[in-house]
Every structure is written in structure tokens, then in C-alpha cells.
Interface confidence: medium
């Protein structure tokens, strides 16, 4: 049973999500060729497990990250506390924004990701994500990501 403080949050964001777009406050060297749906699974105690596979440079990289709940609703930590992750609903139905800040390879970085329940891109959600990113000072281009149900190395 999830704790009352984060039970609703955790359940609301559980399940299958499509990573629609991402941006950062500095260059991230490569854009994934495609991404599989992200699976967010509620764990005991209110934590979330996030799983996604990215096809980059012909290689499939499986990424599993445990988001540890904090006392603040919608706020989690990851990577042994090196990243703080905020999960907040977008004004557009069935969309969420993941905003994270912390360390990447010894440098501070801030990133935002747009998640949607549907694989089709919502221009309304994308525009809201642009505004959110601008407000946060994330000045890199917004990368729209190709979706794939499975990852095939060496091809899409």
C-alpha cells in the first residue's frame, strides 16, 4: 500500500507512457533514433520504477531508474540522490512533464521530458511543454522523439 501522501500521485502516473519530447539547459550530444514506451511501475512505499529503451547509434540501451519518493508530492530522487525529479501534470489531458536537475558526468544539468499516454503527438501539449521549458530557462532545442514499440539494434 502506498503512503497516503504520494499514493494518488504514484498511481496516477503508473503505466505506459510515450516519451514525446525532451530538452535541456545544455547540449545533449545525441538524439535517440527512437524510444520505446516508458513503463512507470509503482513500488511499495511510493517509489516508482521507470523503464525505457532508447535506440542510439544503432544500439539499444535499456534504462531502468528507481525514483525514490520524498515528503514533497510529485518530487523524487534518482541516481543515488544525484538527481531530483519532479513529475507534474500538463494542463493537457493525459500528459505529464518530468523535470529533473542534478549531476550528469560531474556537471550540473537540468532536463525536461514530455510524456503522453497516446503515441500521437499533441501540438497543444507540445506548445505547453515549450512554454514550460522557456520558463525554466531550458534553452536547447526541443527534440521530438520517434516512437517504437520495440527496439531493434542496427535498424529502426
Amino acid at each position: 500500500q502506498d503512503t497516503p501522501a504520494l499514493g494518488k500521485d504514484t498511481v496516477a502516473v503508473s503505466g505506459k507512457w510515450y516519451l514525446k519530447a525532451m530538452t535541456a539547459d545544455q547540449e545533449v550530444p545525441e538524439k535517440p533514433d527512437s524510444v520505446t514506451p516508458m513503463i512507470l511501475k509503482a513500488q511499495k512505499g511510493g517509489n516508482l520504477e521507470a523503464k525505457i529503451t532508447m535506440l542510439t547509434n544503432g544500439q539499444c540501451q535499456n534504462i531502468t531508474v528507481v525514483l525514490h519518493k520524498t515528503s514533497e508530492p510529485g518530487k523524487y530522487t534518482a541516481y543515488e540522490g544525484q538527481r531530483v525529479v519532479f513529475i507534474q501534470p500538463s494542463p493537457v489531458r493525459d500528459h505529464y512533464i518530468l523535470y529533473c536537475e542534478g549531476e550528469l558526468h560531474g556537471r550540473q544539468i537540468r532536463m525536461a521530458k514530455l510524456l503522453g499516454r497516446d503515441p500521437e503527438q499533441s501540438q497543444e501539449a507540445l506548445e505547453d511543454f515549450r512554454e514550460f521549458s522557456r520558463a525554466k530557462g531550458l534553452n536547447q532545442e526541443i527534440l521530438e522523439l520517434a516512437q517504437s514499440e520495440t527496439c531493434s539494434p542496427g535498424g529502426q
Epitope: 535517440p32 542510439t56 540501451q61 541516481y79
Partner: nanobody, 122 residues
Framework: QVKLEESGGGLVQAGGSLRLSCVAS????????TGWYRQAPGREREFVAT????????YYADSVKGRFTISRDNAKNTVYLQMNSLKPEDTAVYYC???????????????WGQGTQVTVSS
Amino acid sequence: QVKLEESGGGLVQAGGSLRLSCVASGRTFSRWHTGWYRQAPGREREFVATLRASGGDTYYADSVKGRFTISRDNAKNTVYLQMNSLKPEDTAVYYCNVWANWGAPPSDFSSWGQGTQVTVSS
């Protein structure tokens, strides 16, 4: 699944040097980003150094800057960590890893090698 095998650790006196090696299986090693991490007893794993696949950009933890150097040999599928001016606080198990997407470094130990122990005595 990529297999990783670290070597080169040992016992050394403060001020001494070691060179760690890590061999990774796989045909596309040159496309991978590479990095070294370490974990001291009772502490969390921490970033030490990373090397970008293209461009050769290197990044170091503040605690090792100017003392450690990361390099790679794509022909040998090997990444190295040259450690100079070692200090007792560098004592840890050192792990390497390789990954495809710069923005998503490895985050769990299940896919890592056994590591190599470095002990620096004073």
C-alpha cells in the same frame, strides 16, 4: 548484454600510481561512451571520469581532476584510467561501464563488472 572486465587494481602507497584497464565485449565499442565509477566501503557509488565516444571530451570529478586521466583504445575494446598522486581517500572498488546515450548513464549494478579493488595506504 555487454560484458565488462576490470583489472589493474592493487595496494599502493600514497603518492603512487596505478593504471586500470577495462575490456568490453562487443563490436561497436567505438560508438560507446565510457566511464569509471568507484564505491568505497559504506559509501554510495560515485562518478570518477567519463569519455565521450565522439570528440574525445573528458569529464572528471573534482576530487580527481589533475591526477586521473581516462583514455581508450578502440582497437582493443579497452578503456583505461591512469591514476597518479594517489591518496588514501581514493581507496575503493573501481568499476567501468559503457553506454550509448550520453544523457542516460548506467544506473544499476546488475549490468556492471566485478570491479577492481584499489587500496591506497598512508
